[in-house]
């Protein structure tokens, strides 16, 4: 037997002026039918029948997956990070082959001192997480390492991380200039060769809420946009109320189609409404306009 879907019919007039008696269905979307066993459901737009109801794919919803949602969940990461690849030359420790072995006691002791030193150097940077030595080589000890930075996601996260990387550069340059050997002795925790300090590469987390929004909106990508509320991005269509881009349909219902958002105007016992925003009311008995 066919699965019957109750549909409420409303008398609506499109902003072009013709009156349509229609369920809340976008008639411009193609119908694909999903059949499971003897249950047949008109699950449109890639939705499938789970035996009870249509399971719809983003950005669709409704009993037959015929309507387009007004907002799509996008989830920016809690935190975003940057990784700086740096090289410094430590002169207060002489290189030995054991330092190349990351499981040796030599490496562990060097790593402990180097980490303590860098924690002191970067202590004023709130985004600083730590350092990770990637390689040690001769010269006295050339230390290839990563400086890890992290911050909470905000729309300005790139600026925050860019600023933090600049401060890292300033601080490592300062310490490697100041903490130098005197008469082959080092009075600091570590001493450095000033000329051995280099920033090799900087990698920043890439997260673009606009791109995520467009991807999830699929063929409606041109009509969904990102607006921020309390520094959180929202992927919305103009049919979502309460945002700057929200479409005001006045005496009508906002509906998404593949041509964008449109207003379907209502007809009441006393008036019919027309206009792009359903703001032109015509009294049925007197036939004059109220603006």
């Amino acid at each position: 037997p066919l699965a019957t879907i109750p549909v409420s019919t409303t008398s609506l007039t499109s902003s072009e002026g013709s009156t349509i008696s229609t369920p809340s269905v976008d008639i411009s979307t193609p119908v694909t039918t999903s059949i499971v066993g003897d249950q047949c459901s008109r699950c449109k737009n890639g939705g499938f029948w789970d035996g009870l109801k249509c399971q719809c794919l983003t950005p669709y919803y409704g009993e037959s997956c015929e309507e387009v949602v007004n907002s799509i969940d996008i989830a920016p990461p809690e935190t975003v990070s940057a990784q700086m690849e740096l090289t410094v030359t430590v002169t207060s420790v002489k290189f030995t082959d054991e330092l190349k072995n990351h499981s040796s006691q030599e490496f562990r002791e060097f790593n402990k001192t180097f980490t303590e030193q860098m924690n002191i150097v970067y202590s004023g940077i709130p985004e600083y997480v730590g350092v990770n030595i990637t390689n040690l080589r001769l010269g006295s000890v050339v230390v290839e390492h990563d400086v890890l930075l992290r911050t909470k996601y905000t729309p300005e996260y790139k600026t925050a991380l860019d600023n933090a990387t600049e401060v890292v550069k300033q601080k490592i340059t300062k310490v490697t200039t100041e903490q130098i050997m005197t008469n082959d002795n080092c009075s600091a925790l570590m001493c450095f060769n000033t000329t051995g300090t280099q920033v090799q590469n900087i990698t920043v987390t890439q997260y673009d809420p606009v791109e995520e929004c467009r991807q999830k909106a699929e063929e409606y990508e041109d009509y969904f946009l990102v607006e921020y509320r309390d520094q959180k991005p929202y992927c919305i269509s103009p049919c979502e109320s309460g945002f700057n881009a929200s479409k005001n349909c006045n005496h009508g219902k906002c509906q998404m189609s593949q041509n964008g958002a449109r207003c379907l105007c209502v007809t009441t016992e006393t008036h019919w409404y027309s206009g792009e925003d359903c703001n032109q009311g015509t009294q049925k008995s007197h036939h004059h306009h109220h603006h």
């Epitope: 030995t96 402990k112 303590e116 082959d184 080092c186 009075s187 001493c191």
Partner: nanobody, 123 residues
Amino acid sequence: EVQLVESGGGVVQPGGSLRLSCAASGDTFSRGSWGWFRQAPGKEREAVALISSDGWTFYADSVKGRFTISQDNTKNTLYLQMNSLRAEDTAVYYCAASVLVLRTLNPKAWHHWGQGTMVTVSS
């Protein structure tokens, strides 16, 4: 893990001598760095005499010509011969070690420490 035990401290008159010893557990004297630090009451710990396996040595200016650092690899023992002792040499003397070949006088760069032995120079 390196374990260090100092001995040889005591009370001595000004101008006298003492020899401090530091016994290390394990076969560790063939590499790394060894040293003596001291800490007088109310003062920071300071480097007195240091030595590394590549031949580097350091003496604090205040002890040059009076103190001598040496090691006996066969006995895994570090020594500090202290001559012409002065009242200002009074302190707790600590033996320190690192498997790294160090050039630093900063005690925070040294990873292994003994419990210390007291040296009092008083008439």
